[in-house]
């Protein structure tokens, strides 16, 4: 993934002031996937396109954020923009469009976060644990937890230890882990999203 944030920004900046206002109002009432919260109205209405892009990505992450943006654009009658956004987010830079995939997590159990759904695969396949720890340290991991994970001898045992702390996390904390996974091992996340 990774291209979605730029594509969302281009789409929102290419809206006129009136269209951006309409987009925000529609975003307040668009149906959301289970487990996702709504951007607060007060904050939303005052945002420019750049702030709104970052808010969409932080609330919904890139994949769902792009899908949601495309849905709202389509609802506004901007079919071509929605199509371009989806095409941009489903292709690597320079690659031919790969065709629109099924929406990520479409087979997800309602209310179950990506990292909970794919716990076993993540324990087995994540190799860049140190990178994840650095991304989570001070945000969702205490110093003690950080050290405890680092002390484990192998990557799977490190990930097991990390998962021992997740029951106390809310959705946003889990999103931080998912975002870190996207940045460190995007191919793994994409593979699991397709599975």
């Amino acid at each position: 993934m990774g291209r979605a944030r730029d594509a969302i920004l281009d789409a929102l900046e290419n809206l006129t002031a009136e269209e951006l206002k309409k987009f925000k109002l529609k975003l307040l009432s668009v149906p959301l996937r289970e487990g996702y919260g709504r951007i607060p109205r007060g904050a939303l209405l005052s945002m420019d396109a750049l702030d709104l892009t970052d808010k969409l990505v932080s609330f919904y992450l890139e994949t769902y954020g792009a899908e949601l943006t495309a849905n709202v654009l389509r609802d506004m009658g901007l079919q071509e923009m929605a199509g371009q956004l989806q095409a941009a987010t489903h292709q690597g830079s320079g690659a031919a469009p790969a065709g629109i995939q099924a929406p990520p997590q479409s087979a997800a159990k309602p209310g179950l976060h990506f990292i909970d759904q794919h716990r076993a695969a993540l324990i087995a396949r994540v190799t860049n644990v140190e990178w994840l720890l650095d991304a989570l340290y001070g945000k969702v991991l205490t110093d003690e937890q950080y050290q405890a994970v680092r002390a484990e001898p192998t990557n799977p045992s490190k990930m097991r230890k990390l998962f021992s702390f997740t029951p106390a996390w809310n959705w946003t904390c889990k999103d931080l882990l998912l975002q870190a996974l996207r940045e460190s091992q995007s191919y793994l996340v994409e593979d699991l999203e397709r599975s």
């Epitope: 990774g2 730029d6 006129t16 990505v57 941009a88 940045e183």
Partner: antibody, heavy 112, light 106 residues
């Protein structure tokens, strides 16, 4: 995939204005951004500004406000940068770029 | 505006050597982008969203970082990697570039 074709070498006198073009093909012009970048000989890249063609939203680096104006003609899928009150400091290669792709650059020489 | 400071400004590396170029931002950014430029040519889109390689970029390249500290790493330097590398942030307007790191082959 987007292709960007820029105008050729430009020669201009100090104090004059010049308009450089960047023609896009291969994708919907109004669905992405066009960024302009300046590079003087042997120097680094300087971000001038960006235009979003559908809305005509533009953003500039403070340094280039008053010097550069970005416009876009949707009918011809062409973006433009106009540089005014030219001095020798404006002599450089000017690139246009989308998110991922760059034009070949236009060399502007300002000389009396 | 966000100022990006690249280091080193110039460096040389032997074939097979590991190379790391850093980019430090004056305030926190969400992602970093990297471009490669060889003399007389346009810059090439190289790494996007901090760690994703653009199409055609060899797997020996990688990107990492968060907040104000980012880096581009070449696991084993090759002659074709000799170029100038620029970082760029797109988190705040203006979307500034770093001053560049010229990488030479020994």
């Amino acid at each position: 995939q987007v292709q960007l074709q820029q105008s050729g070498v430009e020669l201009a006198r100090p104090g004059a204005s010049v308009k450089l073009s960047c023609k896009a093909s291969g994708s919907t012009f109004t669905s992405y951004s066009i960024t302009w970048v300046k590079q003087r000989t042997g120097q680094g890249l300087e971000w001038i500004g960006v235009i979003y063609p559908r809305s005509d939203n533009t953003y500039y680096d403070e340094k280039f406000k008053g010097k550069a104006t970005l416009t876009a003609d949707k009918s011809s899928s062409t973006a433009y940068i106009e540089l005014r009150s030219l001095t020798s400091e404006d002599s450089a290669v000017y690139f246009c770029a989308t998110r991922d792709y760059w034009g070949q650059g236009t060399t502007l020489t300002v000389s009396s | 505006q966000i100022v990006l400071t690249q280091s080193p400004a110039i460096m040389s590396a032997s074939p097979g050597e590991k190379v790391t170029i850093t980019c430090s931002a004056s305030s926190s950014v969400s992602y970093m982008y990297w471009f490669q430029q060889k003399p007389g040519t346009s810059p090439k889109f190289w790494i996007y969203s901090t760690s994703n390689l653009a199409s055609g970029v060899p797997a020996r390249f990688s990107g990492s970082g968060s907040g104000t500290s980012y880096s581009l790493t070449i696991s084993r330097m090759e002659a074709e990697d000799a170029a100038t590398y620029y970082c760029q942030q797109r988190s705040n307007y203006p979307f500034t570039f770093g001053s560049g790191t010229k990488l030479e082959i020994k």
